[in-house]
Amino acid sequence: QEDEDGDYEELVLALRSEEDGLAEAPEHGTTATFHRCAKDPWRLPGTYVVVLKEETHLSQSERTARRLQAQAARRGYLTKILHVFHGLLPGFLVKMSGDLLELALKLPHVDYIEEDSSVFAQSIPWNLERITPPRYRADEYQPPDGGSLVEVYLLDTSIQSDHREIEGRVMVTDFENVPEEDGTRFHRQASKCDSHGTHLAGVVSGRDAGVAKGASMRSLRVLNCQGKGTVSGTLIGLEFIRKSQLVQPVGPLVVLLPLAGGYSRVLNAACQRLARAGVVLVTAAGNFRDDACLYSPASAPEVITVGATNAQDQPVTLGTLGTNFGRCVDLFAPGEDIIGASSDCSTCFVSQSGTSQAAAHVAGIAAMMLSAEPELTLAELRQRLIHFSAKDVINEAWFPEDQRVLTPNLVAALPPSTHGAGWQLFCRTVWSAHSGPTRMATAVARCAPDEELLSCSSFSRSGKRRGERMEAQGGKLVCRAHNAFGGEGVYAIARCCLLPQANCSVHTAPPAEASMGTRVHCHQQGHVLTGCSSHWEVEDLGTHKPPVLRPRGQPNQCVGHREASIHASCCHAPGLECKVKEHGIPAPQEQVTVACEEGWTLTGCSALPGTSHVLGAYAVDNTCVVRSRDVSTTGSTSEGAVTAVAICCRSRHLAQASQELQ
């Protein structure tokens, strides 16, 4: 999940020098940018979120808003400041003519401006059938801990909080920020207004059909009776949660956002801030049978984004559309014909479908995990959700071909025990956005702030790439992949792990002159090899060179093609041990895999040799996958020989710490 992607319209309005009487001009060379939703029908022109630079104080925000009003008035325009943001993002919400955008972009402290846009509930349809009573025996599901230490915030429609399923479990806050319903003849029927929110509250914490039966909830109304809201209303809701958290700090917080709109820089930024304040955000991937990266908050990297599967673990089809997919989805969860509280009556049940229902399942699982281990960080929780998921059960044929490799084949599940996973070395795979096809294009994959980048690989469908390297960016390692001339673009693939007290560094060897190939090892005492990367400047990496094989007995070393620079990720962490596992196939093969055995975690995945017919390498759960070009296009047998190299690690320190706890 990347912040800077999405089929997103960015209009940079250059600053003009004739601005009248600006006391403080913007910093030299900076240009504030204007953003709007790429989906035209969802745009709400006339209302704008003006986002100010990070360090801007509330008083400066208010002053900037007043200044905009004054300058607009001098031009004969009326403006209305609807809200001044502080607590999450500095800025303000203003109702004004689009003619004033150029003026607003020149104001001091302005970082960017985003036109408001719509967000929508992600359940379709809203009343398939009435089900009374629920279709299962309550005995079947008695969780050990019902999430009683956790508060779940629900940003949704109004809800029927006295429904028998959820009475006493949901506190309806006084927060309400919703647009008017569309259509002059719209009839506000209470039960329909409450439908979406009531159902989701029931899925999260319902007495009989809920996941986390002990969780208490707080609801904020950001969606109207038609299930429609705005980015600005959602932002103000997230700010309300942050302020509540500051006024009255409680235990762990989970925020459920069962809604989606077009890609929104400001909504993603607000989610990032809230996540960094220790809040777990769970959102619907969206019901558009599309790349989730094109929607918000689904595309926010800090948010846990959930796609929907059915009882057969297949992606959910919703009419002509269905669940979203792609690299911005973290995992899938049940989202078809989900039984929950119906607002039609106080004892009614209904089944609803969608990524909203899937997200509610994951919010419930998260509440239970956090109740059992309240100190879990967002990164730890995400890694556990991934670790305990059912793997490789989704039929990927449902997804577009180019999205299959990017979409996680994971269906959320409750851990067998809510305790005792501490010994595990947890890792996950993070794909970058596509680089684009230009010669010098690169793609960057990043880990979360409290994860370690243990290895970096790259993948190109055309095979035209120039490898990858780990490099420092803002004090953290990132994984950068390089496109090659004539290539259609590359992906960078980061292996992101939870490794407490780790000290990792990258050791690089430049291309070797000798024919033996390039090699680099971890020479520091106590450092172990966790990943290998190779990067080359030449367009075609010696197609007819013989393959380079790793010398036996040198597990702490990366080897590669003599024309490539080789990068070794070397880490020191208490009790960390790693080993190299290889699987070579002499005959041409489109895919070669090697897996780490039980108790070991895959940290590194690379290919030998790094020749141009290798499309790339990537980790899928605990398996290293190396993909090659279609064998029919491969020349000689020797050229077709590929070895998948996995680096498998475990932490004796984590295992011991876990045993001491038990």
């Epitope: 025996r137 029927q160 006295d162 009475e167 007495r207 009989d208 039966k213 009556c345 106080s346």
Partner: antibody, heavy 115, light 109 residues
Framework: QIQLVQSGAEVKKPGASVKVSCKAS????????ISWVRQAPGQGLEWMGW????????NYAQKVQGRVTMTTDTSTSTVYMELRSLRSDDTAVYFC????????WGQGTTVTVSS | QSALTQPASVSGSPGQSITISCTGT?????????VSWYQQHPGKPPKLMIY???NRPSGISNRFSGSKSGNTASLTISGLQAEDEADYFC?????????FGGGTKLAVL
């Protein structure tokens, strides 16, 4: 603290109606409805129905359906239970209780139906 | 005729444990997590002792515990005390309403 305070005892003739009130306080009213339960002398408990403070929706037990009406007055946080066409077997103590979970109870209102 | 069946009476000596059963069907006790137990002293309103099968409200002694197996719920009182002498009622959700048991008179000998 959370309280449900009911109106005083009533003596009614057969065929008449009775209206018992229950004033709620100390909690968020819209998070719970109010259940009505009655107990005939020396007998067990019988659930009569439920009303929502949130939207006024009701759910009546089949046995009293057609004779009972539950209403709310949100301005005074009060719920009313009216039972019509009283018979001698309606003689009972009538309780209001919070929600379907019935975790808090009123003190009870004795209704005597006698000619 | 109550929908849920309870023994009319049980007895025990101080310090002993007793169990009261509450039998229903798959449409009530067996189908829902929402079985409650109430204690009622003469002339007083009922008092919630156990909710959602096995949860105790705050302030209720841990001598009171609840469980459920299939269509039968149980209330166990350990370390019987004189003040436990009262009537005990179980209740359960049904699809659209609530049902009570006929009540069990507990005598502490």
């Amino acid at each position: 603290q959370i309280q449900l305070v009911q109106s005083g005892a009533e003596v009614k003739k057969p065929g008449a109606s009775v209206k018992v009130s229950c004033k709620a306080s100390g909690y968020t009213l819209t998070s719970y409805g109010i259940s009505w339960v009655r107990q005939a002398p020396g007998q067990g408990l019988e659930w009569m129905g439920w009303i929502s403070f949130y939207n006024g929706n009701t759910n009546y037990a089949q046995k009293v359906q057609g004779r009972v009406t539950m209403t709310t007055d949100t301005s005074t946080s009060t719920v009313y239970m009216e039972l019509r066409s009283l018979r001698s077997d309606d003689t009972a103590v009538y309780f209001c209780a919070r929600g379907y979970g019935m975790d808090v109870w009123g003190q009870g209102t004795t209704v005597t139906v006698s000619s | 005729q109550s929908a849920l069946t309870q023994p009319a009476s049980v007895s025990g000596s101080p310090g002993q444990s007793i169990t009261i059963s509450c039998t229903g069907t798959s449409s009530d006790v067996g189908g829902y997590n929402s079985v409650s137990w109430y204690q009622q002293h003469p002339g007083k309103p009922p008092k919630l002792m156990i909710y959602e099968v096995s949860n105790r409200p705050s302030g209720i002694s841990n001598r009171f515990s609840g469980s459920k197996s299939g269509n039968t719920a149980s209330l166990t009182i350990s370390g019987l005390q004189a003040e436990d002498e009262a009537d005990y009622f179980c209740s359960s959700y049904t699809s659209t309403s609530m049902v009570f048991g006929g009540g069990t008179k507990l005598a502490v000998l």
